[in-house]
């Protein structure tokens, strides 16, 4: 998380400061990874685009008994605290394919990452 | 631990302005969406504001255009400035942590009384 | 807007006894497989206290002998012994559309 540092001092919260402990927990979860993640369990993919964080709360919630992402649940939900409309939730999934969650955690903090280092923080 | 404390409560006449804050702590607060809630005497709870950790707002039609979520990442605050205050405002009003509309309400602070009377 | 209209009102029961309120919302608040129902606890002078959230999910603290059950537009909290801590009032939520709306709430008093 080297291209993450020097949020670290003093001084206002950027508004990086939610994308960044979103990404922090999402590398919590990578690194102390011992068994198949959620048991292997299996969620759809999503596009990597606008209603990103509402499409992977979707997605992920869909994941029951698994303590190790909740926490990421609740983050998530930070972002999309209010239902998106069913207009706009349509567009949110690609209900085509099915990827385990451990991979899903992996492209999520990749595709955070990316955002991060372009600042994009919302 | 979780802490949300509430102030700025008062008497204020009708057509007046009010601007709550909430103070928290025990927990990254950036990251989380927060809400008002709001409670009139011997009556049940009504939703009034939320803020997104983006900072997207919400808000009923009792109280759009009048109320105002903010919020000050750097402070760890939450604001609720009321507007053209009703005599139907009054209410003690709770700052809560939302986790969202799969979570609900987690945690909620211990309430600021608005009266709005003449 | 989703009414939520709770039953009873307001209950009598003793220490030990099993409580059942109901709570029926206007209209479905099942979104993706899960109902968007919380309940809460809230005692006079006191904040609300999360008990439940999604239907069914104990909140992380709270004793076991509350549960919840329902989908679609019916729903219940169960407290299978009553402890005397448990008196207070009750209320249920949705939040599958704006404006989240609560239950006019259930308060349960010592017999």
């Known amino acids: 998380l080297t291209c993450l540092g020097g949020f670290a001092s003093p001084g206002p919260v950027p508004p990086s400061t939610a994308l960044r402990e979103l990404i922090e927990e999402l590398v919590n979860i990578t690194q102390n990874q011992k068994a198949p993640l959620c048991n292997g369990s299996m969620v759809w993919s999503i596009n990597l685009t606008a209603g990103m964080y509402c499409a992977a709360l979707e997605s992920l919630i869909n994941v029951s008994g698994c303590s190790a992402i909740e926490k990421t649940q609740r983050m998530l939900s930070g972002f999309c605290p209010h239902k998106v409309s069913a207009g706009q939730f349509s567009s949110l999934h690609v209900r085509d394919t099915k990827i385990e969650v451990a991979q899903f955690v992996k492209d999520l903090l990749l595709h955070l990452k990316k955002l991060f280092r372009e600042g994009q923080f919302n | 631990e979780v802490q949300l404390v509430e102030s700025g409560g008062g008497l204020v006449q009708p057509g007046g302005s009010l601007r709550l804050s909430c103070a928290a702590s025990g927990f990254t607060f950036s990251s989380y969406a927060m809400s008002w809630v709001r409670q009139a005497p011997g009556k049940g709870l009504e939703w009034v504001a939320s803020i997104s950790s983006g900072d997207t707002t919400y808000y009923p039609d009792s109280v759009k255009g009048r109320f105002t979520i903010s919020r000050d990442n750097a402070k760890n605050s939450l604001y609720l400035q009321m507007n053209s205050l009703r005599a139907e405002d009054t209410a003690v009003y709770y700052c809560a942590r939302l986790d969202g509309y799969y979570f609900g309400f987690p945690y909620w602070g211990q309430g600021t009384l608005v009266t709005v009377s003449s | 807007d989703i009414q939520m209209t709770q039953s009873p009102s307001s209950l009598s029961a003793s220490v030990g006894d099993r409580v059942t309120i109901t709570c029926k919302a206007s209209?479905?608040?099942?979104?993706?497989?899960?109902?968007?129902m919380h309940w809460y606890q809230q005692k006079p002078g006191k904040a609300p206290k999360l008990l439940i959230y999604?239907?069914?999910n104990l909140e992380s603290g709270v004793p076991s002998r509350f549960s919840g059950s329902g989908s679609g537009t019916d729903f219940t909290l169960t407290i299978s012994s009553l402890q005397p801590e448990d008196f207070a009032t009750y209320y249920c939520?949705?939040?599958?559309?704006?404006?989240?709306?609560f239950g006019g709430g259930t308060k349960v008093e010592i017999k």
């Open positions: 209209e479905s608040v099942d979104h993706s497989g899960s109902s968007l």
């Open positions: 939520q949705q939040s599958n559309e704006d404006p989240w709306t």
């Open positions: 999604r239907a069914s």
